[in-house]
Interface confidence: low
Amino acid sequence: LPSCKEDEYPVGSECCPKCGPGFHVRQACGEQTGTVCEPCSPGTYIAHFNGLSKCLQCQMCDPAMGLRTSRNCSTTANALCGCSPGHFCIIQDGDHCAACRAYATSSPGQRVQKGGTESQDTLCQNCPPGTFSSNGTLEECQHGTKCSKWLVTEAGPGTSSFRWV
């Protein structure tokens, strides 16, 4: 292969000028002609100077994976996915989030120790003896009534197991 300059790409034993971001190569250069570049069509992009014959497909942000589009795709930049409200990122792939998960819900008998963020699940903590939380949404447990002992001892522990993948 020929040793091409940074703004060129190899074609056989020759070097042709690259197309700019947002364009792909429609026709390689010839002896008398430069590279023929064509704009990327909607739903495709190329972010850099390139010698590609086709533009790259924009990524879709799948709501079933808890994702929403945080930046729309343009012909020069791929879409970026973020987590839908109430979700946090559990699988990062390169520079984007590939899957989000809904925050854990604290069980009755637990308090919310730390609320969820885009990269971190809700952390639940069992209420101390003599206090209670009837629905698991409170940040502080309330001081007990006659049934607080039952609430503390019978409620199962929450599952705030975050996965890094």
Epitope: C89, I90, I91, Q92, D93, G94, A98, A99, R101, A102, K114, T117, E118, S119, Q120, L123, S161, F162, R163, W164, V165
Partner: antibody
Framework: QVQLQQSGAELVRPGTSVKISCKAS????????LGWIKQRPGHGLEWIGD????????KYNEKFKGKATLTIDTSASTAYMQLSRLTSEDSGVYFC??????WGQGTSVTVSS | DVVMTQTPLTLSVTIGQPASISCKSS???????????LNWLLQRPGQSPKRLIY???KLDSGVPDRFTGSGSGTDFTLKISRVEAEDLGVYYC?????????FGGGTKLEIK
């Protein structure tokens, strides 16, 4: 580009402790978990635990509770794992790994008298 | 803990030929959120592990499409359509559905 750089190999005596480090470059310390994994020939890979740099709390595999202590120094972008009361069973290669699938190069720990 | 059993232990394949690795879990890996947290890793000789596949079948960035992951419940498969020299190493399956995370024992892919 995130990179995880681990401290060098350790040769330590039984009954002592060792602390190994994992220094991150890039943004891993603000938005992802960091885990530690043990590898021993014939035993494959074992997950030890995770630490969350932003919140300073950990999750441990029950098997390693009391053996491994995970800490973090956010200002130095460095995570640490201390292994205590070492025996020959603790010999192996220890990896740190980030949620975005970045792995350190591994730190070999050899426990020998 | 969930036990992950990989077969075969060793796989000897000619370059250009296909390869298949099986991974079985002692419990279903289908999580309550409807996702199955099963990854495949490759550890090349003398290197750190590298994730190839996550969520059973999704390829990581930069992983060639000759790799495919499939399966559900307790039975999972990693297939390589045409083995290349750079594919040699030890392949691990890795579940994250149940606490604690657990790995398969590994399958060593050698080139004939």
């Amino acid at each position: 580009q995130v990179q995880l750089q681990q401290s060098g190999a350790e040769l330590v005596r039984p009954g002592t402790s060792v602390k190994i480090s994992c220094k991150a470059s890039g943004n891993i310390f603000t938005n992802s978990w960091l885990g530690w994994i043990k590898q021993r020939p014939g035993h494959g890979l074992e997950w030890i635990g995770d630490v969350y740099p932003g919140g300073g709390y950990n999750k441990y595999n029950e098997k390693f509770k009391g053996k491994a202590t995970l800490t973090i120094d956010t200002s130095a972008s460095t995570a640490y794992m201390q292994l205590s009361r070492l025996t020959s069973e603790d010999s192996g290669v220890y990896f740190c790994a980030g949620a975005m699938d970045y792995w350190g190069q591994g730190t070999s720990v050899t426990v020998s008298s | 803990d969930v036990v992950m059993t990989q077969t075969p232990l060793t796989l000897s394949v000619t370059i250009g030929q296909p390869a298949s690795i099986s991974c079985k879990s002692s419990q279903s890996l289908l999580d309550s959120d409807g996702k199955t947290y099963l990854n495949w890793l490759l550890q090349r000789p003398g290197q750190s592990p590298k994730r190839l596949i996550y969520l059973v079948s999704k390829l990581d960035s930069g992983v060639p499409d000759r790799f495919t992951g499939s399966g559900s419940g307790t039975d999972f498969t990693l297939k390589i359509s045409r083995v290349e020299a750079e594919d040699l190493g030890v392949y691990y399956c890795w579940q994250l559905t149940h606490f604690p995370q657990t790995f398969g024992g590994g399958t060593k892919l050698e080139i004939k």
